[in-house]
């Protein structure tokens, strides 16, 4: 069969080769493959200014294989498509286009957004958060004793991060002021901070609320940290007025 095809081609192409290479059924020196062996795909390959026929077992990027009875070829994907399954179903779009249901689009349809990483149109994903966790214990400077007013915090987790066009996440941290029943700190609760404060002046900006007022000292044993002269207490009151208590919410 191949021989007879070769003879015929010689009439149209004086340079038909006797032995075709690379899956060609018929070929010529000038045009390369003219036809292919069964199951192979004919394709045009550009070599310099010239296009020659080649026979391939699979088609190159930008082409898909079309099979007709006893004749197969590589057929170009649409102009905006890089890789396709067939003429009407693209699997990867060229730069600047977004893939949606096998088509390449300039812009994604309503209700979808462009994913610039995958270059696909994807559903808009809104933020989802869990229920709030319980409030934390009321604390002041990390301590749960030795003060009247402090702050408590609660948190919730992000279950689903939003996509670019999705609704932003609501705050995941919430802080509020709280009041506790005054209780004295036990020995073990004071820690290193307390022992250091005995030997040095208090830090600037330290809140008055961290220590009980003078009335409370009457009903409780004095402990070293609470011994302050009146001058120091006056100084602390001025500092407290200058420092306003702010509660921030983290997004």
């Amino acid at each position: 069969q191949n021989a007879s095809r070769g003879r015929r081609q010689r009439r149209m192409h004086p340079n038909v080769s006797q032995g075709c290479q690379g899956g060609c059924a018929t070929c010529s020196d000038y045009n390369g493959c003219l036809s292919c062996k069964p199951r192979l795909f004919f394709a045009l390959e550009r070599i310099g200014m010239k296009q020659i026929g080649v026979c391939l077992s699979s088609c190159p990027s930008g082409y898909y294989g079309t099979r007709y009875p006893d004749i197969n070829k590589c057929t170009k994907c649409k102009a905006d498509c890089d890789t396709c399954f067939n003429k009407n179903f693209c699997t990867k779009c060229k730069s600047g286009f977004y893939l949606h249901l096998g088509k390449c689009l300039d812009n994604c349809p309503e209700g979808l957004e462009a994913n610039n990483h995958t270059m696909e149109c994807v559903s808009i994903v809104h933020c989802e958060v869990s229920e709030w966790n319980p409030w934390s214990p009321c604390t002041k400077k990390g301590k749960t004793c030795g003060f009247k007013r402090g702050t408590e915090t609660r948190v919730r987790e992000i279950i689903q991060h939003p996509s670019a066009k999705g609704n932003l996440c609501p705050p995941t941290n919430e802080t509020r002021k709280c009041t506790v029943q005054r209780k004295k700190c036990q020995k073990g609760e004071r820690g290193k901070k307390g022992r250091e404060r005995k030997r040095k002046k208090p830090n600037k900006g330290e809140s008055k609320e961290a220590i009980p007022d003078s009335k409370s000292l009457e009903s409780s044993k004095e402990i070293p940290e609470q011994r302050e002269n009146k001058q120091q207490q006056k100084k602390r009151k001025v500092q407290d007025k200058q420092k306003s208590v702010s509660v921030s919410t983290v997004h």
Partner: antibody, heavy 119, light 107 residues
Framework: EVQLVESGPGLVKPSETLSLTCTVS????????WNWIRQPPGKGLEWIGY???????YQNPSLKSRVTISRDTSKNQFSLKLSSVTAADTAVYYC?????????????WGQGTLVTVSS | DIQMTQSPSSLSASVGDRVTITCKAS??????LSWFQQKPGKAPKTLIY???RLVDGVPSRFSGSGSGTDYTLTISSLQPEDFATYYC?????????FGQGTKVEIK
């Protein structure tokens, strides 16, 4: 030189089946692709379908339900049957061949035969 | 199916003129295009295949060019025997479709 000659009745009644044969010389129909093409009077060319070197066929979807292409390798002939004809099927019918995507398409043609559909 | 739009449908020219006929495909046909010449009462004759390859025996005054969807047949210097109807054919996929033809007449 490859030669193709069409033969068959020149007149067919409406609703009947048109039957044509193409006899090939100078080559074997067990290689290449053997086609039927038609041309209504004063109009353009329309491709009907082909039969391949192995006997597989492919028809133009616009005519597929009415077209049958077959062959007789012992006589080196291939045939066209077009059923349920109407006046719109009046045309010159050509057989032609090609050998693959890299060579000339329809390098060889028959001389054509006019088929008129009329009662 | 791929549609082939050929233009002009007819043209008048003189011997020695340069004639250009165009064929536009409804989608990229990747150079799988042939040109045919047909004279009255005769079968078409293949002139060019794969856009620009001349069939053996066809005069070099005939040339083809183009890519994508737009293709051209040029006759550089029209000869008396060139007055005929010209058709383009795409064979990028099946079904194959021809252009509607361009009749080249004597001016």
């Amino acid at each position: 030189e490859v030669q193709l000659v069409e033969s068959g009745p020149g007149l067919v009644k409406p609703s009947e089946t048109l039957s044509l044969t193409c006899t090939v010389s100078g080559d074997s129909i067990t290689s290449g692709y053997w086609n039927w093409i038609r041309q209504p009077p004063g109009k353009g060319l329309e491709w009907i379908g082909y039969i391949s070197y192995s006997g597989k066929t492919y028809q133009n979807p616009s005519l597929k339900s009415r077209v049958t292409i077959s062959r007789d390798t012992s006589k080196n002939q291939f045939s066209l049957k077009l059923s349920s004809v109407t006046a719109a099927d009046t045309a010159v019918y050509y057989c032609a061949t090609y050998y693959g995507y890299g060579g000339p398409w329809f390098a060889y043609w028959g001389q054509g035969t006019l088929v008129t559909v009329s009662s | 199916d791929i549609q082939m739009t050929q233009s002009p449908s007819s043209l008048s020219a003189s011997v020695g003129d340069r004639v250009t006929i165009t064929c536009k495909a409804s989608q990229d046909i990747d150079s799988y295009l042939s040109w045919f010449q047909q004279k009255p009462g005769k079968a078409p004759k293949t002139l060019i295949y794969l856009t620009n390859r001349l069939v053996d025996g066809v005069p070099s005054r005939f040339s083809g060019s183009g890519s994508g969807t737009d293709y051209t047949l040029t006759i550089s210097s029209l000869q008396p025997e060139d007055f005929a109807t010209y058709y383009c054919l795409h064979y990028d996929e099946f079904p194959l479709t021809f252009g509607q033809g361009t009749k080249v007449e004597i001016k």
